[in-house]
Interface confidence: low
């Protein structure tokens, strides 16, 4: 429960705080739990605690690991867990996911990134920014304090942003690199109660016994981006994951965008080898977001043969 | 930025019916979802149902089925709640609130498309107290 | 409906504390959470969405991680004017409910 996730690259300072709170007064030991050996507290070494941080300047890949800190007050001890990886840097410019920070959201008029972890660093102005690796220029970005403010704020904007920055620890420099996704709010579109275009409420469909059978569950939810899109097929009220049936599987077809602007989704239903027992199961099509579930119900049943007319 | 500015306090007796309303200044909210969500005293927040201004339609929480109404008026901006059949414990503060629509990264959801919603704006509420 | 359960239901710290609030789904709502603060007399705030997603002009002291059932808020330096009702949301799936609200108090 009190553990945190802490990463960093290679050759960079990495400074962790310890995930258990405590009074600045108190006394907070470090230990590498794999070995339960205690961390120095002397800065001349590479890896060192600092009162509630753990210093890694710089951190290389062998110092990935559990790191356990415990803050001890007179009245009581509280343990906590700093799972630490340092990863090799990235000979090309894509930032895994591994090494991205939350992501963050503006629009045209607030547009804020603030460079994650920053505070745990002794670092001083101005930071330096990258957009998708590339170092931002032009009178639109403005490195501010610990942050960046992108003017005009475009869709275009979206990306994953890298602050870059010196961390100074008794007089040697060390850098510091994060990045995070910066996401731009879309003010344009609407959302409507999910309409389903197929198949039709109560519909019955014909399908011949030891052969395949598809159902599309085709839905609309407005226009321009949507919230919890999705469509899905049920067996008598189970979810296809659920129902262990592994002749029948669902899977999403084209996420479409009409010329209209309409967002719609569809989830087709594959049966193979339909048996007479799948003529007894009710299948709903169901699409939902955040008005509000629709449900049509379909029903298979055994297609006449053409010469069947006595 | 847009501001929800919502009616004043009501008093009202067991069986009768108040409407709240909820108008959005400084711009409109006819691109985003609007939640009624309520606050009895000294208890935590509870989801109503909302409306899509733009096109009226609503939404409502099992809960409130029959007894709610969500209604707009897309001339004013202005969004309305109508609860009926009062009793006493819908003695509560009624808020309003706007929903929000940020594209985010496909990745960070399992479900549908990677369209995320939440209620960013939020009126000052409306006090309704039910007393006979 | 998907319960949300938040604990603990009351915390009491100090200014500089670093402070968690744990939040649990009934069943698995994705990264579909968002943190609300609310202080006495006013309405909520948005703080944290999409379970770790900042919103803008929050603080970055702020922080959400988890997914599926388990979500934490995390507030790496008590703020005097973080005391107040923090309450969890779910986006996952209609009706739409909150946690009952955890009270973060003055030690």
């Known amino acids: 429960k009190f553990s945190k996730q802490s990463w960093g690259l290679e050759n960079e300072a990495l400074i962790v705080r310890c995930p258990r709170q405590g009074k600045p007064s108190y006394t907070v030991d470090w230990y590498y739990s794999q070995t339960n050996k205690s961390i120095p507290t002397q800065e001349r070494n590479r890896v060192f605690a600092s009162g509630q941080l753990l210093k890694f300047l710089p951190a290389a890949v062998a110092d990935s690991g559990i790191y356990t800190c415990i803050v001890r007050s007179p009245t009581f001890n509280r343990t906590g867990y700093a799972n630490v990886t340092i990863y090799k840097k990235q000979s090309d410019c894509n930032v895994p996911d591994y090494l991205m920070y939350s992501t963050v959201s503006g629009s045209e008029k607030n547009s804020k990134i603030y460079c994650p972890t920053i505070d745990l660093y002794n670092w001083t102005a101005p930071l330096e920014w990258f957009k998708n690796c590339q170092a931002l220029q032009g009178s639109r970005y403005r490195a501010h304090k610990s942050f960046l403010v992108i003017d005009n704020v475009m869709t275009e904007d979206a990306g994953d942003y890298t602050c870059k920055f010196i961390h100074n620890e008794n007089g040697a420099n060390y850098s510091v690199t994060a990045t995070r996704s910066f996401t731009v709010k879309d003010e344009q579109g609407f959302s409507l109660f999910p309409v389903i275009g197929a198949p039709a409420q109560n519909e019955i469909k014909e399908v011949e016994i030891g052969k395949n059978a598809n159902l599309t569950c085709s839905a609309c939810f407005g226009k321009g981006t949507q919230f919890l899109a999705a469509v899905l097929w049920q067996l008598n009220g189970t979810k296809i994951t659920d129902f262990g049936e592994p002749r029948i599987q669902q899977e999403e077809g084209q996420n479409q965008s009409f010329s209209n602007g309409l967002a719609c989704l569809d989830m087709v239903l594959r049966i193979a080898d339909v048996k007479e027992e799948d003529l007894l199961l009710q299948y709903d099509c169901l699409a939902l977001n955040l008005h509000g579930l629709r449900r049509h119900t379909v029903r298979l049943s055994r297609k006449n043969p053409i010469d069947h007319h006595s | 930025q847009v501001q929800l500015v919502q009616s004043g306090a009501e008093v009202k007796k067991p069986g009768a019916s108040v409407k709240v309303s909820c108008k959005a200044s400084?711009?409109?909210?006819?691109?985003?979802?609007v939640s009624w969500v309520r606050q009895a005293p000294g208890q935590g927040l509870e989801w109503m149902g909302g409306?899509?201004?733009?096109?009226?339609?609503?939404t409502y929480a099992q809960k409130f089925q029959g007894r709610v109404t969500m209604t707009r008026d897309t001339s004013t901006s202005t969004v309305y709640m109508e609860l009926s059949s009062l009793r006493s414990e819908d003695t509560a503060v009624y808020y309003c609130a706007k929903g929000d629509i940020v594209v985010v990264p496909a990745a960070m959801f399992s479900l549908g498309p990677g369209y995320y919603y939440y209620m960013d704006v939020w009126g000052k509420g409306t006090t309704v107290t039910v007393s006979s | 409906d998907i319960q949300m359960t938040q604990s603990p239901s009351s915390l009491s710290a100090s200014v500089g504390d670093r402070v968690t609030i744990t939040c649990r789904a009934s069943?698995?709502?994705?990264?579909?959470l968002n943190w609300y603060q609310q202080k006495p007399g006013k309405a909520p705030k948005l703080l944290i969405y999409?379970?770790?997603s900042l919103q803008s002009g929050v603080p970055s002291r702020f922080s959400g991680s988890g997914s599926g059932t388990d979500f934490t808020l995390t507030i790496s330096s008590l703020q005097p004017e973080d005391f107040a009702t923090y309450y969890c949301?779910?986006?996952?799936?209609?009706?739409?409910?909150f946690g009952q609200g955890t009270k973060l108090e003055i030690k």
């Open positions: 949301q779910q986006a996952n799936s209609f009706p739409i409910t």
């Open positions: 069943q698995s709502i994705s990264s579909y």
């Open positions: 409306i899509n201004p733009s096109r009226g339609t609503t």
């Open positions: 400084g711009g409109t909210f006819s691109n985003y979802g």
């Open positions: 999409a379970a770790s």
